[in-house]
């Protein structure tokens, strides 16, 4: 039995997958910040997790996915205010009793040190210094991401 949050996450991810393929993104759009091969958008307003998820989708992006501790630290370095929390694309899957990224993969327990409980209706937020489990209904800011298309150098044969 999937929770409403899980259903929302799956529905949005599926609808994103169904959309026609768009040309690769070479530069970050206005107001987005580049972090390595990603563009990040830090919201100014606050929303519960599922609205944040949906908002990123309307921007042809997703809630932030963090690959490892290194990426977490670099992302946290972009957060200017100490006390502010941002939703990322990770929530607790009741059916699998584990933290699950919105792309369907599970959290590697070594990647993030989460403060708080792993339980139903829990979603993950990050601050400048920490990673927290919060009720998904909590209204906080959020981070959307777009993947940049790597520019491969063309190799021309000798003329």
């Amino acid at each position: 039995q999937k929770s409403s949050i899980e259903k929302c996450s799956v529905d949005i991810q599926q609808s994103r997958n169904k959309t026609t393929e768009r040309p690769g993104l070479l530069n970050c759009p206005i107001y987005w910040q580049q972090l390595r091969e990603k563009c990040l958008l830090f919201s100014h307003t606050v929303n519960p997790w599922n609205n944040s998820l949906a908002d990123c989708s309307t921007k042809e992006s997703s809630l932030l996915l963090i690959r490892d501790k290194d990426e977490l630290i670099h992302t946290q370095n972009l957060i200017r205010d100490k006390a502010i929390l941002f939703w990322i694309g990770l929530n607790f899957s009741l059916s699998e009793k584990n933290w699950k990224w919105i792309n369907g993969s599970f959290l590697n327990s070594n990647d993030l040190e989460i403060r708080g409980d792993a339980k139903e209706n829990s979603c993950i937020s990050i601050s400048q210094t920490s990673v927290y489990s919060e009720y998904c209904s909590t209204e906080i800011r959020w981070i959307c991401q777009k993947e940049l298309t790597p520019v491969r150098n063309k190799v021309y044969p000798d003329s």
Partner: antibody, heavy 117, light 110 residues
Framework: QVQLQESGPGLVKPSETLSLTCTVS????????WSWIRQPAGKGLEWIGR???????NYNPSLKSRVTMSVDTSKNQFSLKLSSVTAADAAVYYC???????????WGQGSLVTVSS | QSALTQPPSASGSPGQSVTISCTGT?????????VSWYQQHPGKAPKLMIY???KRPSGVPDRFSGSKSGNTASLTVSGLQAEDEADYYC??????????FGGGTKLTVL
């Protein structure tokens, strides 16, 4: 280039509902938030509220009980309804793009609304 | 009465610098780095000049700069030009998705 155009009646009777629509051209409405701001003659600006294209709304607390906003992404339009208007609601009403929820980078030219019987 | 306090008027001669202040509280200006400034010429829509305290949109001359200290934000116009004569409004995010404006400052180029 993004352009916004307000439309609606220029005259509204007291106690009736003011209705305005903003049409967005030169870009998709979907990727941003959209706000309404008003300016009484010779006075300053007042933020009325914003709408996200997912349908979520945020309203100025002082106007919240009278304001309704909606969005139609298929028409690239968003709308404002302000009920129970009085002479104090007479103003130029602007629609604006609200990229992150704290500032406005594109504005309509404004729509003058007079409240009179 | 506006939530943010601005001086009603400011003036300067061409080439000079003028600073317009915008004073709020710890619940708006002091609490967030989300202050913006707008220029409005008579009969026209406002134009964004500064956002997020000090960022300038493309097309805005670098003569316009923004800063913040505590609960007060400032807009500085250096090298004043005749076309800078206009009304200037500050705005700030004010928590729980609210937003407030200042009362406006009429800038006169002498």
């Amino acid at each position: 280039q993004v352009q916004l155009q307000e439309s609606g009646p220029g005259l509204v009777k007291p106690s009736e509902t003011l209705s305005l629509t903003c049409t967005v051209s030169g870009g998709s409405i979907s990727s941003y938030y959209w706000s309404w701001i008003r300016q009484p003659a010779g006075k300053g600006l007042e933020w009325i509220g914003r709408i996200y294209t997912i349908g979520t709304t945020n309203y100025n607390p002082s106007l919240k009980s009278r304001v309704t906003m909606s969005v139609d992404t298929s028409k690239n339009q968003f709308s404002l309804k302000l009920s129970s208007v009085t002479a104090a609601d007479a103003a130029v009403y602007y629609c604006a793009r609200d990229p992150l929820g704290s500032f406005f980078d594109y504005w309509g030219q404004g729509s003058l609304v007079t409240v009179s019987s | 009465q506006s939530a943010l306090t601005q001086p009603p008027s400011a003036s300067g001669s061409p080439g000079q610098s003028v600073t317009i202040s915008c004073t709020g509280t710890s619940s708006d200006v002091g609490g967030y780095n989300y202050v913006s400034w707008y220029q409005q010429h008579p009969g026209k829509a406002p134009k964004l000049m500064i956002y997020e305290v000090s960022k300038r949109p493309s097309g805005v001359p670098d003569r316009f700069s923004g800063s913040k200290s505590g609960n007060t934000a400032s807009l500085t116009v250096s090298g004043l030009q005749a076309e800078d004569e206009a009304d200037y409004y500050c705005s700030s995010y004010a928590g729980i998705n609210n937003l407030v404006f200042g009362g406006g400052t009429k800038l006169t180029v002498l």
